[in-house]
Amino acid sequence: DYKDHDGDYKDHDIDYKDDDDKLVPPGEDSKDVAAPHRQPLTSSERIDKQIRYILDGISALRKETCNKSNMCESSKEALAENNLNLPKMAEKDGCFQSGFNEETCLVKIITGLLEFEVYLEYLQNRFESSEEQARAVQMSTKVLIQFLQKKAKNLDAITTPDPTTNASLLTKLQAQNQWLQDMTTHLILRSFKEFLQSSLRALRQMGDLISVPVDSRGSEQKLISEEDL
């Protein structure tokens, strides 16, 4: 088994896929339906589940990226990374165990996710066999943002990216040569994975993410859709 540059196993299981290898549409998973005894998910549990769903999607996309290019082992990535302004957690954001601050952290998570949206849009035409996963990651991130915005008390502190700036960034990214586009794809996926993991660690520190109901296989099956909001 190969391991890519960031430690993912090639044979990593994608929990949100059903046995026929298709994405399970929201609310249509028989395993979810056949569990009437299950308590409804709290908003925090939904957020937790949603993030894990997205992380599984990223893992699928990273597999395709790493299989078709050598970007995952590239040593030139730091150079390319300087041209991307990808959101990253820092100590000052209040999301780490030391210096943890719930409100500051929640603002950082939402702001960061909003900033990632343009990069997720860029990813939409970058995959062949995983086109559906790329779309699912993008859409479920939008839903996650809405969930988190409902949780945040200080919405005024959240800065929304300028649409014009985003449009021009998207054009610039799409105009890169093939090698740089492959590198950009790899860096976006790696950074988004790290940001979501940091976010999940922080959200679990917020105290009310205690019990996450799962099916008997321990799989996170259902994508949370906008109708669930």
């Epitope: 196993y9 999301c95 660690r201």
Partner: antibody, heavy 121, light 110 residues
């Protein structure tokens, strides 16, 4: 071949300090979550803490304030700074490479051989 | 504070036996559980992660199951090289935790 080699263990007096190193070869340290785990003689595994790729550190309750995990990516080396050592800190200390899917679920898929720390007067 | 409780603490078995080790979390940890094998004087070795996924190179006689709070490691037909101590590890939360590992189960020769 990927290797993790711990060093810096030895005999230290109660109240003293020690810094353990874990030199990593064959991989880029900055791309991995890393952990320290210890094992007292004849006892089970005891988690000390994690350092994640985002540079955040998480510690066991008993280790907070006394133990500090850091990394020097340019040297491909992980560190464990241990202060105010007690007799009960006597153990073999392992560094381990993590691979994380979600948040804290760091499966430790590669371990060093361990270094023995003895705290005694 | 999530606590991991393993049982039994030791088990005596013969080659060819089916051995089951359980691990219980004090609160739900979803499917975020790993199992390790450790032999005397050696570093632990990852066997299973995310409850049921076998790590690279691990024989198929090892399997894991469970979700939420109750987990099981099963060795379907014990081999001589399987006599060792086994540990579970929760990965759901590492904040406000004393130990992410269970206390261990020693599998001994009957």
């Amino acid at each position: 071949e990927v290797q993790l080699v711990e060093s810096g263990g030895g005999l230290v007096q109660p109240g003293g300090s020690l810094r353990l190193s874990c030199t990593v070869s064959g991989i880029d340290l900055s791309s991995y979550d890393m952990s320290w785990v210890r094992q007292a003689p004849g006892k089970g595994l005891e988690w000390v803490g994690y350092i994640y790729t985002d540079s955040s550190t998480y510690y066991a309750n008993w280790a907070k304030g006394r133990f500090t995990i850091s990394r020097d990516n340019s040297k491909n080396t992980l560190y464990l700074q241990m202060n105010s050592l007690r007799a009960e800190d006597t153990a073999v200390y392992y560094c381990a490479r993590g691979s994380t899917d979600y948040a804290f679920d760091t499966r430790l898929d590669l371990w060093g051989q361990g270094t023995l720390v003895t705290v005694s007067s | 504070d999530i606590q991991m409780t393993q049982s039994p603490s030791s088990v005596s078995a013969s080659v060819g036996d089916r051995v089951t080790i359980t691990c219980q979390a004090s609160q739900s940890i979803s499917n975020e559980l790993s199992w390790y094998q450790q032999k005397p004087g050696k570093a632990p070795k990852l066997l299973i992660y995310r409850t049921s996924t076998l790590a690279s190179g691990v024989p198929s006689r090892f399997s894991g199951s469970g979700s939420g709070t109750d987990f099981t490691l099963t060795i379907s037909s014990l081999q001589p090289e399987d006599f060792a101590t086994y540990y579970c590890q929760q990965g759901y939360n590492s904040n406000d935790v004393d130990n992410v590992f269970g206390g261990g189960t020693k599998v001994e020769i009957k």
